[in-house]
């Protein structure tokens, strides 16, 4: 049964012709999978700093070291990519500072899909001396493990030379790798050393090795392909918001939700209220009012702005997001004074967001 | 392995009440709306409405408010949809869905007198 | 509420054509899911927000498109491919489905 009764129908229909969301874009910090990323808190005087990812609290492990105002992740694939939160709490007060990582490497292996510099990897030696396989650019090969979305092309190199000219095959999980292995087969680029994979799929996660061998000697290298797939989650809110806040009788003020959901969301903001002079119904239920929601007559819904206020505009006010796959909800208070108070903004330290997962 | 498992076949006269299960396994049934969704025989999908079943949020379509009422038992992992007043174009297959990518393996509601 | 109309409604095609099915929404969108279906099987998914390949789907299914005008297409078409396939919006109530594009065997 539902956990609220609300005092009046509230249909959410029509909704409006919706729009990509992208409200309160955040700094964005690039690396490619492999890389080690570090970013510094931007916030100032913090005593404590706490840090989430996708709005769950995240803590140390062996790739996440958190030092002070750092974050640093080693090794990054791109199930670090994300929304990130720094909040610095402190005696009066407590700040969030949002930043995206992303994590991507659309044409793996640290080089153009165009291979333009490839040719000067095929070295060509004296006839006179014979040698075996050896690596010649070993700087391209560092990456041994490449995190890849689904859907994207990976290229994997084994730059070498050697007299006789070496040849080169491919391994997968340490047996022959054949056309048929895999949907739309890949390429080999024998003049730049290259294996080529294009849209690839789960099914392509594995070893790939690559063979390089003459008549006086073989050598190989090995490279870890994980291709990680993205799925749509619940909407997410920003930590500390809506913010708590007063005014005095007559005057007017704002609650902001940010939110970030790559499905359309759909915002409501609902406010505890009295019927009968009851703030719950026979049920035991809280009497819900529906301020404001996302559709067609809803102009900004991230921001809800009250204006002229009175004495009974106080209260608990609920920003309440929702897309297909679930919801998350936040709420603040709204303290009114009399009019002889001076309003003043009221930051308070914020306990760890109601996200419902 | 993620599992929606629902309720077997029905049989019923016009005018009768149908309640079909979906129970859920495999990840977390509180976090994410329940849909429901039907299919009547040769015909396209349509949605009928959805439950978030961590706090009993409903969203129907309008076609069928009023008839389909939507519920849930978080202790079980189970959801629960039931079309009243039933007519015999509601003969169709119904399906639970969540996230859009985990489906149950559907029901079929044949209403004939 | 928003309407999506496939086209075509049928299709014959052979194994190892490349099949494009459009869907048009009556409002702006901003993302489309796909989903195929076999007889008496329940849809799967194979796309969501437009574009993103659903866990297990082969990569020769892909989807493109925006505002109005979605497309899915099929690179190579396999024999395990013939079926229905439904466009679908869960972007505003009543989250909507288009009639359906039946693909079959040539």
């Known amino acids: 049964r539902p956990s609220f009764s609300l005092v009046e129908d509230t249909t959410l229909e029509p909704e409006e012709p919706p729009t990509k969301y992208q409200i309160s874009q955040p700094e964005v910090y690039v690396a490619a999978p492999g890389e080690s990323l570090e970013v510094r808190c931007l916030l100032k005087d913090a005593a404590v700093i706490s840090w989430t990812k996708d709005g769950v609290h995240l803590g140390p492990n062996n790739r996440t070291v958190l030092i002070g105002e750092y974050l640093q992740i080693k090794g990054a694939t791109p199930r670090d990519s994300g929304l990130y939160a720094c909040t610095a709490s402190r005696t009066v007060d407590s700040e969030t500072w949002y930043f995206m990582v992303n994590v991507t490497d659309a044409i793996s292996s640290g080089d153009d899909e165009d291979d333009t510099d490839g040719a000067e990897d095929f070295v060509s030696e004296n006839s006179n001396n014979k040698r075996a396989p050896y690596w010649t650019n070993t700087e391209k090969m560092e990456k041994r493990l490449h995190a890849v979305p689904a859907a994207n092309t990976v290229k994997f190199r084994c730059p070498a030379g050697g007299n006789p000219m070496p040849t080169m095959r491919w391994l997968k999980n340490g047996k022959e790798f054949k056309q048929e292995h895999r949907i739309g087969g890949y390429k080999v680029r024998n003049q730049h050393w290259s294996l080529i994979m294009e849209s690839v799929v789960p099914s392509d996660k594995g070893n790939y090795t690559c063979v390089v061998e003459n008549e006086y000697g073989s050598i190989n290298h090995t490279y870890h392909l994980d291709v990680v797939e993205r799925s749509p989650h619940r909407p997410i809110l920003q930590a500390g918001l809506p913010a708590n806040a007063s005014t005095v009788v007559g005057g007017d003020v704002e609650f902001v939700c940010k939110v970030y959901s790559d499905a359309q969301p759909h915002i409501q903001w609902i406010k505890h209220v009295e019927k009968n002079g009851s703030k719950y119904g026979p049920d035991g239920l809280p009497y819900l009012k529906v301020l404001k929601h996302s559709g067609i007559n809803s102009s900004n819904a991230e921001v809800l702005a009250l204006f002229n206020v009175t004495e009974a505009d106080a209260g608990e006010y609920i920003c309440k997001v929702s897309n297909y796959i679930g919801q998350a909800n936040q709420s603040a208070w709204l303290t009114v004074l009399p009019k002889q108070q001076a309003p003043g903004r009221e930051k308070e330290i914020t306990a760890s967001p109601d996200y419902l997962e | 392995e993620v599992q929606l498992v629902q309720s077997g076949a029905e049989v019923k006269k016009p005018g009768a009440s149908v309640k079909v299960s979906c129970k859920a396994s495999?990840?977390?049934?509180?976090?994410?709306?329940m849909h429901w969704v039907r299919q009547a025989p040769g015909q396209g999908l349509e949605w009928m409405g959805a439950?978030?079943?961590?706090?009993?949020?409903?969203n129907y379509n309008q076609k069928f408010k009023g008839r389909v009422t939507l519920t849930r038992d978080t202790s079980i992992s189970t959801a629960y949809m039931e079309l009243s007043r039933l007519r015999s174009d509601d003969t169709a297959v119904y399906y639970c869905?969540?996230?859009?990518?985990?489906w149950g393996q559907g029901t079929t509601v044949t209403v004939s007198s | 509420a928003i309407q999506l109309t496939q086209s075509p409604s049928s299709l014959s095609a052979s194994v190892g054509d490349r099949v494009t099915i459009t869907c048009s929404a009556s409002?702006?969108?901003?993302?489309m899911s796909w989903y195929q279906q076999k007889p008496g099987k329940a849809p799967k998914l194979l796309i969501y927000?437009?574009?993103n390949l659903a866990s297990g789907v082969p990569s020769r299914f892909s989807g493109s498109g925006s505002g109005t005008d979605f497309t899915l297409t099929i690179s190579s078409l396999q024999p395990e491919d013939f079926a229905t396939y439904y466009c679908?919006?869960?972007?505003?109530?009543?989250?909507?489905f288009g009639q359906g594009t039946k693909l079959e065997i040539k």
């Open positions: 927000d437009t574009s």
């Open positions: 679908q919006q869960w972007s505003s109530y009543p989250y909507t």
């Open positions: 439950i978030y079943p961590e706090n009993g949020d409903i």
């Open positions: 869905t969540s996230r859009g990518d985990y």
């Open positions: 409002s702006g969108l901003s993302y």
């Open positions: 495999g990840y977390t049934f509180t976090n994410y709306w």
